[in-house]
Interface confidence: low
């Protein structure tokens, strides 16, 4: 068998909401993957498991099952959404994400994704990790790959 290539493209969109009382930020982060099947037979994308970390803490997890199949020598682009919550000991980020006098509300998130594919009863797992910048101050739609190169402003302590 030839390889199945998984390429994490980046953040497609991030939609933000807030809980005033709990000083909590909710970020729904939609990511894009390119999965390429270099074989002369179809493969099934059985599941995608993803998690997002902020400051070494897991803030969101997602799992998609029975996603799609990819034909021979074909590529499919797959979007998946991870709901994340920045709260509790990270509630200091709340001011940072919502102040107008801060123009750039980008935070650094670690995106981890594992794709499980199957063909002829054989299962294969491919994992990727990538640091991405996400704006926690407003709803944002990114050009694909753009969130990798944004400037990030860390809050002043």
């Amino acid at each position: 068998p030839r390889s199945i290539d998984v390429k994490y493209i980046g953040v497609k969109s991030a939609y933000v909401s807030y809980d005033v009382q709990k000083r909590t930020i909710y970020l729904n982060i939609t990511n894009t993957l390119n999965i390429t099947n270099n074989n002369y037979y179809s493969v099934e994308v059985e599941n995608i498991t993803a998690q997002v970390q902020f400051a070494k803490t897991v803030i969101g997890k997602a799992r998609l099952n029975n996603i799609t199949h990819i034909g021979p020598l074909d590529m499919k682009q797959i979007d998946y959404t991870v709901p994340t919550v920045i709260a509790e000991e990270m509630s200091y980020m709340y001011d940072f994400c919502t102040l107008i006098s801060i123009k750039v509300h980008n935070i650094v998130l670690m995106m981890q994704v594992t794709v499980t594919t199957t063909y002829f009863g054989h299962s294969e797992q491919i994992s990727q990790e990538r640091y991405q910048y996400v704006d926690c101050g407003r709803n944002t739609t990114y050009q694909l790959g753009q969130s990798e190169y944004l400037n990030v402003l860390q809050p002043q302590q």
Epitope: Y18, V20, T98, I100, S101
Partner: antibody, heavy 118, light 112 residues
Framework: QVQLQQPGAELVKFGASVKLSCKAS????????MHWVKQRPGQGLEWIGN????????HYSQKFKDKATLTVDRSSNTAYIQLSSLTSEDSAVYYC???????????WGQGTTVTVSS | DIVMTQASPSVSVTPGESVSISCRSS???????????LYWFLQRPGRSPRLLIY???NLASGVPDRFSGSGSGTAFTLRISRVEAEDVGVYYC?????????FGSGTKLEMK
């Protein structure tokens, strides 16, 4: 220690322009917004606008959009306000003040008194 | 634009007593993050303004705890307990929730 140094006074002719300076020291100039505030004799404070020295982004009060231009010189850690087409209404004390991302308007200059003479 | 109103141009107080200075905003200064973006400043005669209170109720560094700020989204109060001679001057509120930022017209504190 943090200081915002402004010249004490400027005497300018009616219809002319003037560029006032505010030299910052004792902190990282590009990490704080610089604001400009006007106070006419015996009157209250008016917010003119602010500038982010790191990239020169500005915000102005509508009233001062055609009157004031805010700039910075990062090499000398100095903020400037240029006032154009001066009239007697522009005779006032002009203060600079800094504010951080966490919003404390904690340091002010001593103010420059602008007198417009005909 | 947000309009800040200080209805009392002046207040008179006996040293040692308490006094309250009020300020209103034309719309709520309560942000989605739970903070209320209102400053109080004191300008003594012939001096630059000095920050007293930030985010409605937080005491600025070096300010005596005789000063306190309170309020709702649109109505705010600066309270000075045990007023001293050095407290005379003009007190200004200022909103910084939205551009353009704006000041109230000021309230002059005088001694009886």
């Amino acid at each position: 220690q943090v200081q915002l140094q402004q010249p004490g006074a400027e005497l300018v002719k009616f219809g002319a322009s003037v560029k006032l300076s505010c030299k910052a020291s004792g902190y990282t100039f590009t990490s704080f917004w610089m604001h400009w505030v006007k106070q006419r004799p015996g009157q209250g404070l008016e917010w003119i606008g602010n500038i982010d020295p790191s990239d020169s982004e500005t915000h102005y009060s509508q009233k001062f959009k055609d009157k004031a231009t805010l700039t910075v010189d990062r090499s000398s850690n100095t903020a400037y306000i240029q006032l154009s087409s001066l009239t007697s209404e522009d005779s006032a004390v002009y203060y600079c003040a800094r504010s951080s991302n966490w919003d404390n308007f904690d340091y002010w200059g001593q103010g420059t008194t602008v007198t417009v003479s005909s | 634009d947000i309009v800040m109103t200080q209805a009392s141009p002046s207040v008179s107080v006996t040293p040692g007593e308490s006094v309250s200075i009020s300020c209103r905003s034309s719309q709520s200064l309560l942000h989605v993050n739970g903070n209320t973006y209102l400053y109080w400043f004191l300008q003594r005669p012939g001096r630059s303004p000095r920050l007293l209170i930030y985010r409605m109720s937080n005491l600025a560094s070096g300010v005596p705890d005789r000063f306190s700020g309170s309020g709702s989204g649109t109505a705010f109060t600066l309270r000075i307990s045990r007023v001293e001679a050095e407290d005379v001057g003009v007190y200004y509120c200022m909103q910084h929730l939205q551009y353009p930022f704006s000041f109230g017209s000021g309230t002059k504190l005088e001694m009886k």
